[in-house]
């Protein structure tokens, strides 16, 4: 997250970290069910671990943390590497979470976002770009949903209805390492960090997010079919 600020503790209990061994964070994810996460399809790895209820980026033990294995990762069948459409994936955890103040699911919004809607994006991704500098703790940033026209103007021929753009002033954006993490609007999950320009936070080049309102049926059916 570029030019965000430290999230208040316990305010993002749905935020998950996807880790490669030993403890290398490579993507964010979101708890949407007691045993299921959503993340970006481009974050798919065969071997990874899931950390929930953790505030700092470092692997130091925190009393609220819960660690999991992913037993199934189900990318949306319409995703196409290295493209950006349908960039979402469900991950089934090896057991159900223990609900606490630090670990709790969030509902996926069935309403599509309208321009001007205020949202919050979070993650442990780099805080500088093109340089790489990772934060000590989870970062939060207020962003506004842009109109689809502004989004298409920013990225001609690259935007479809499975995506939406959001940003703030130049210099504020999600970035590498935030992928798969949550965009929360009006208390529900509206999007996932998907892609954007490089370097991040350039003027008139907003972040692009997976438009989850288009996938509520797929999410529900996939969880039901695999539970």
């Amino acid at each position: 997250i570029i030019n965000g600020s430290d999230c208040d503790m316990h305010t993002q209990p749905w935020q998950a970290a996807l880790l490669l061994r030993p403890n290398q964070l490579y993507c964010g994810a979101v708890l949407v069910h007691p045993q299921w996460l959503l993340t970006a399809a481009h974050c798919r790895k065969k071997v990874f671990r899931v950390r929930l209820g953790h505030y700092s980026l470092s692997p130091v033990y925190e009393s609220g943390q819960q660690m999991f294995q992913g037993v199934k990762s189900i990318p949306h069948p319409g995703y196409s590497h290295p493209g950006h459409s349908n960039d979402l994936m469900l991950i089934k955890l090896n057991r159900r979470i223990r609900p606490t103040k630090d670990v709790r699911p969030i509902n996926v919004s069935s309403h599509c976002p309208s321009a001007g809607t205020k949202c919050l994006v979070s993650g442990w991704g780099t805080t500088k770009s093109p340089q790489v500098h990772f934060p000590k703790v989870l970062q939060c940033l207020n962003i506004s949903v842009l109109s689809q026209k502004r989004c298409e103007d920013a990225y001609p021929r690259q935007i479809d209805d499975t995506m939406f753009c959001a940003g703030d002033k130049a210099g504020r954006d999600s970035c590498q390492g935030d992928s798969g993490g949550p965009v929360v609007c009006n208390g529900s999950l509206q999007g996932l960090v998907s892609w954007g320009d490089y370097p991040c936070a350039r003027p008139n080049r907003p972040g692009v997010y997976t438009n989850l309102c288009k996938f509520t049926k797929w999410i529900q059916e996939t969880i039901q079919a695999n539970s």
Partner: antibody, heavy 117, light 110 residues
Framework: EVQLQESGPGLVKPSGTLSLTCAVS????????MSWVRQPPGKGLEWIGD???????DYASWAKGRVTISQDSSKNQVSLKLSSVTAADTAVYYC???????????WGQGTLVTVSS | AYQMTQSPSSLSASVGDRVTITCQAS??????LAWYQQKPGKAPKLLIY???TLASGVPSRFSGSGSGTDFTLTISSLQPEDFATYYC????????????FGGGTKVEIK
């Protein structure tokens, strides 16, 4: 050097159990998923199953109930057991490492197992 | 059940030819497809993963494309060392799968 080496008896009697081990060197099993694949003489590749560092195991549907895949991280080895074998199980058996992006990037040289009395 | 079908099962070509092998999945596997080359008596070798990403050390004459259900492996200019059997493998799911591999395509000298 990253290497995989399968070993085990080359001959197994019908209705017996085929047991193979795959010795892993040059990388820790804790970081990778491992696969077993077989190839009957003159035929194509058949996936048998995968084992993950967390000991989660996926088996091919034909192998469920007959195949057991396990690993010993302290010895850095993966094992395959196939019970109630018939002549149709005669094949070259390979272990392979997944590159973490769903491609098998390191393979053992394979070991031929013949099922015959 | 996800099934992988390769075509053709064999083909004859000459050095310098452009060769195309196709792999079709019975359901969408998104981009989780790998291609392997196998020579007689040897273990398979990874050529391409994620449908189009070239594995380390693989010559650039090999390329992969496709997503969903239809995939292609192309050898832009066939070399003598490329005469071998080629297999595709899906990595989308392991649930209720008989085989993740396609049936293979043998590339022979014309």
């Amino acid at each position: 050097e990253v290497q995989l080496q399968e070993s085990g008896p080359g001959l197994v009697k019908p209705s017996g159990t085929l047991s193979l081990t795959c010795a892993v060197s040059g990388f820790p099993l804790s970081n990778y998923a491992m696969s077993w694949v077989r190839q009957p003489p003159g035929k194509g590749l058949e996936w048998i199953g995968d084992i993950y560092p967390s000991d989660i195991i996926d088996y091919a549907s034909w192998a469920k109930g007959r195949v057991t895949i396990s690993q010993d991280s302290s010895k850095n080895q993966v094992s395959l057991k196939l019970s109630s074998v018939t002549a149709a199980d005669t094949a070259v058996y390979y272990c392979a490492r997944d590159n973490n992006d769903y491609g098998l990037d390191i393979w053992g040289q394979g070991t031929l197992v013949t099922v015959s009395s | 059940a996800y099934q992988m079908t390769q075509s053709p099962s064999s083909l004859s070509a000459s050095v310098g030819d452009r060769v195309t092998i196709t792999c079709q999945a019975s359901q969408s596997i998104s981009s989780w497809l790998a291609w392997y080359q196998q020579k007689p008596g040897k273990a398979p070798k990874l050529l391409i993963y994620l449908a189009s990403t070239l594995a380390s050390g693989v010559p650039s004459r090999f390329s992969g494309s496709g997503s969903g259900t239809d995939f292609t492996l192309t050898i832009s200019s066939l070399q003598p060392e490329d005469f071998a059997t080629y297999y595709c493998q899906q990595g989308y799911t392991n649930s209720n799968i008989i085989n993740t591999f396609g049936g293979g395509t043998k590339v022979e000298i014309k």
